[in-house]
């Protein structure tokens, strides 16, 4: 058998069974379950004299371990005295010692009930900056109790002066409070309130519960952006897992392909959100040809707080294709904002919904952060539309008054792009249409000027500019005037903004 340290138990009589005139009394200490021999038992009798006798060790039949009892007989004023039995087992370790301090006899007592209560979450279901744990030690026969707080089994340095005791009838109750930071509480540690009373230990433990039902943990798998697919030619797909409760358990994301072929190396990012949840993203590079040929990619998500593995799959969208129509406008000057203008781009009637929108100035692509583009929305027909908005400065348009709105879409030909130029001052600079046939029903104009355009603030348009009614299915006021430039040679018309 391997080395085993002893368990030590005090042996006392019931106080009511000891005659009040007894001049001496015997108490004992049991050391059991140790191996090998020997144990050394010594007694601290305080100011009293006592005689000790240690019985020979006996072998426990089943385990082959040993047990021994040491007896102490004391005389004199033993009733108020505490005695300590000290058991050493050097085979376990040279300094292995267990002390048990107790009185001669045990009174009948009602043991305490130990219960930890936890402070509430805030109204939104989130943990406050600090969490209070309240240890209620209730319903015990009045007497000395000792409260200790443990964190993952280790004694904590806690100010216990706040503990308060009350007595109700013949029983007493005590409570002790522990304040923890949110960080400690969320770290998944176990907190224990340990109560020592009449030589016995009572305890209760608590920890932050795993959400029994995940708070709507969601996983999403994106398709590659048309820009990455057709322009950069380095498409990636991203598996996004949101609203995870932070915990020791890590999120496991596994990529696979329906064809069974190997996947590339993915990159992973974890972000703690303001609301305390965790967001995990994994980005996988995919082959352009593989994607275009219809390969299906799968992202499998497992986490201790998820009841079942989550699977997300993505593949090239099936169904009809339609190229986008691109229309770009400049808003008129607004009082008080002479040095800034907003450009708008409507891209519509495209299928499927995957589209990338870019703005260019001076043949340079502007950062995505410069413009704001809506998510694709369904038109009344079968296609989709988006709006994109770009704010430009006077310095930019004075440098070169031509801005290009470009849509990247798989159905656009010849190079998956359609773009439209727009000028802040259309009378001074005209854009040109590229890769865009004039859609049917765009304008009805007679080729003659139809009077002053409504939105131009009284300015007369460029002589080659003709105004006409907007499209019947335009998502805006039907009376909106638009401007067409009659260009020689190239495309017979172009949008140059609101008239």
């Amino acid at each position: 058998a391997s080395t085993q340290s002893p368990s030590v138990f005090p042996l006392t009589r019931c106080c009511k069974n000891i005659p009040s005139n007894a001049t001496s009394v015997t108490l004992g200490c049991l050391a059991t379950g140790y191996f090998p021999e020997p144990v050394m038992v010594t007694w601290d009798t305080g100011s009293l004299n006592g005689t000790t006798m240690t019985l020979p060790a006996t072998t426990l039949t089943l385990s082959g371990h040993y047990a021994t009892i040491s007896l102490l007989t004391v005389s004199g004023a033993w009733a108020k005295q505490m005695f300590t039995c000290r058991v050493a087992h050097t085979p376990s370790s040279t300094d292995w010692v267990d002390n048990k301090t107790f009185s001669v006899c045990s009174r009948d007592f009602t043991p305490p009930t130990v219960k930890i209560l936890q402070s509430s979450c805030d109204g939104g279901g989130h943990f406050p900056p600090t969490i209070q744990l309240l240890c209620l030690v209730s319903g015990y026969t009045p007497g000395t109790i000792n409260i200790t707080w443990l964190e993952d089994g280790q004694v904590m340095d806690v100010d216990l002066s706040t503990a308060s005791t009350t007595q109700e009838g013949e029983l007493a109750s005590t409570q002790s409070e522990l304040t923890l930071s949110q960080k400690h509480w969320l770290s998944d540690r176990t907190y224990t309130c340990q109560v020592t009373y009449q030589g016995h230990t009572f305890e209760d433990s608590t920890k932050k519960c795993a959400d029994s039902n995940p708070r709507g943990v969601s996983a999403y798998l994106s398709r590659p952006s048309p820009f990455d697919l057709f322009i950069r030619k380095s498409p990636t797909i991203t598996c996004l897992v949101v609203d995870l409760a932070p915990s020791k358990g890590t999120v496991n994301l596994t990529w696979s392909r329906a064809s069974g072929k190997p996947v590339n190396h993915s990159t992973r990012k974890e972000e703690k959100q303001r609301n305390g949840t965790l967001t995990v993203t994994s980005t996988l590079p995919v082959g352009t040809r593989d994607w275009i040929e219809g390969e299906t990619y799968q992202c499998r998500v497992t986490h201790p707080h998820l009841p079942r593995a989550l699977m997300r799959s993505t593949t090239k969208t099936s169904g009809p294709r339609a190229a986008p129509e691109v229309y770009a406008f400049a808003t008129p000057e607004w009082p008080g904002s002479r040095d800034k203008r907003t450009l708008a781009c409507l891209i519509q009637n495209f299928m499927p919904e995957d589209i990338s929108v870019q703005w260019l100035h001076n043949e340079v692509q502007l950062p995505d952060a410069r413009h704001s583009t809506t998510q694709p929305r369904k038109t009344k027909g079968s296609g989709f539309f988006v709006f994109s908005r770009l704010e430009v400065t006077r310095a930019e348009w004075e440098q070169k008054d031509e801005f290009i709105c470009r849509a990247v879409h798989e159905a656009a030909s010849p190079s998956q792009t359609v773009q439209r130029a727009v000028s802040v001052n259309p009378g001074l600079a005209g854009g040109s249409a590229q890769s865009q046939r004039a859609p049917d029903r765009v304008l009805c104009h007679s080729g003659q000027q139809q009077g002053l355009p409504r939105a131009a603030g009284g300015s007369v348009p460029h002589p080659r500019c003709h105004c006409g009614a907007g499209r019947a299915d335009w998502p805006g006021p039907p009376e909106l005037d638009v401007c067409v430039e009659e260009a020689e040679g190239e495309a017979p018309w172009t949008w140059t903004g609101l008239c």
Partner: antibody, heavy 119, light 110 residues
């Protein structure tokens, strides 16, 4: 091949307890989330509980408290403990394996074990 | 809690008929709707997973469609062995709901 064999059903009095076992073979149990589904005579399927590969468990609203799901991967067994049995717990209890890749449903079911609660 | 409402509860049809069973979720399901077939005295059998993917060994006359909250199982040409009860299941999570299964649709011989 994949096999799930339930046992532990039978006739039990109201208020009694039962422990259903599901012996799994033909696959690696630790790789799969496992579910118990029940079906009262002549009625539809009713989800009871699920235990994921990490050993964490969830229950249908009505099952919380009286039902306890557990797994012992070393014994290739999944358990369902039912306490304080009621007449309405009378049903065939199916042990079922969730698809490995997840969020796709149950690809293998046991034949079921009948639990009858009656005095 | 996502609730699954299946309709109709029963349908009478003849061999070679086209049969469609619908399942409505109380809120949008991103992924993971499954369909099962159950015959008397037998456990259910997985037919369709992830809305529309045919499970291994399932004949191609079975197809699944739908997105968001509306889903359908279609049997393009009913065969004698298809007379059974069909269940949809929201398989994305084990929500704390009363049930993640639809109430079932019994396909009977006309």
């Amino acid at each position: 091949q994949v096999q799930l064999v339930e046992s532990g059903g039978g006739l039990v009095q109201p208020g009694g307890s039962l422990r259903l076992s599901c012996a799994a073979s033909g696959f690696t149990l630790s790789n799969h989330d496992m579910t118990w589904v029940r079906q009262a005579p002549g009625k539809g399927l009713e989800y009871v509980s699920i235990i994921n590969t990490y050993g964490n468990h969830w229950y249908a609203n009505w099952a919380s408290g009286r039902f306890t799901i557990s797994r012992d991967n070393s014994k290739n067994t999944v358990y369902l403990q039912i306490d304080s049995l009621r007449a309405e717990d009378t049903a065939t209890y199916y042990c079922a394996r969730e698809t490995h890749h997840g969020s796709s449903g149950i690809d293998h079911w046991g034949q079921g074990t009948l639990v009858t609660v009656s005095s | 809690d996502i609730q699954m409402t299946q309709s109709p509860s029963s349908v009478s049809a003849s061999v070679k008929d086209r049969v469609t069973i619908t399942c409505q979720a109380s809120e949008s399901i991103y992924s993971g709707l499954a369909w099962y077939q159950q015959k008397p005295g037998q456990p259910p059998k997985l037919l369709i997973y992830d809305h529309s993917t045919l499970a291994s060994g399932v004949p191609s006359r079975f197809s699944g469609s739908g997105s968001g909250t509306e889903y359908a199982l279609t049997i393009s040409s009913l065969q004698p062995e298809d007379f059974a009860t069909y269940y949809c299941q929201h398989a994305d999570y084990a929500h704390h709901s009363d049930n993640v299964f639809g109430g079932g649709t019994k396909v009977e011989i006309k």
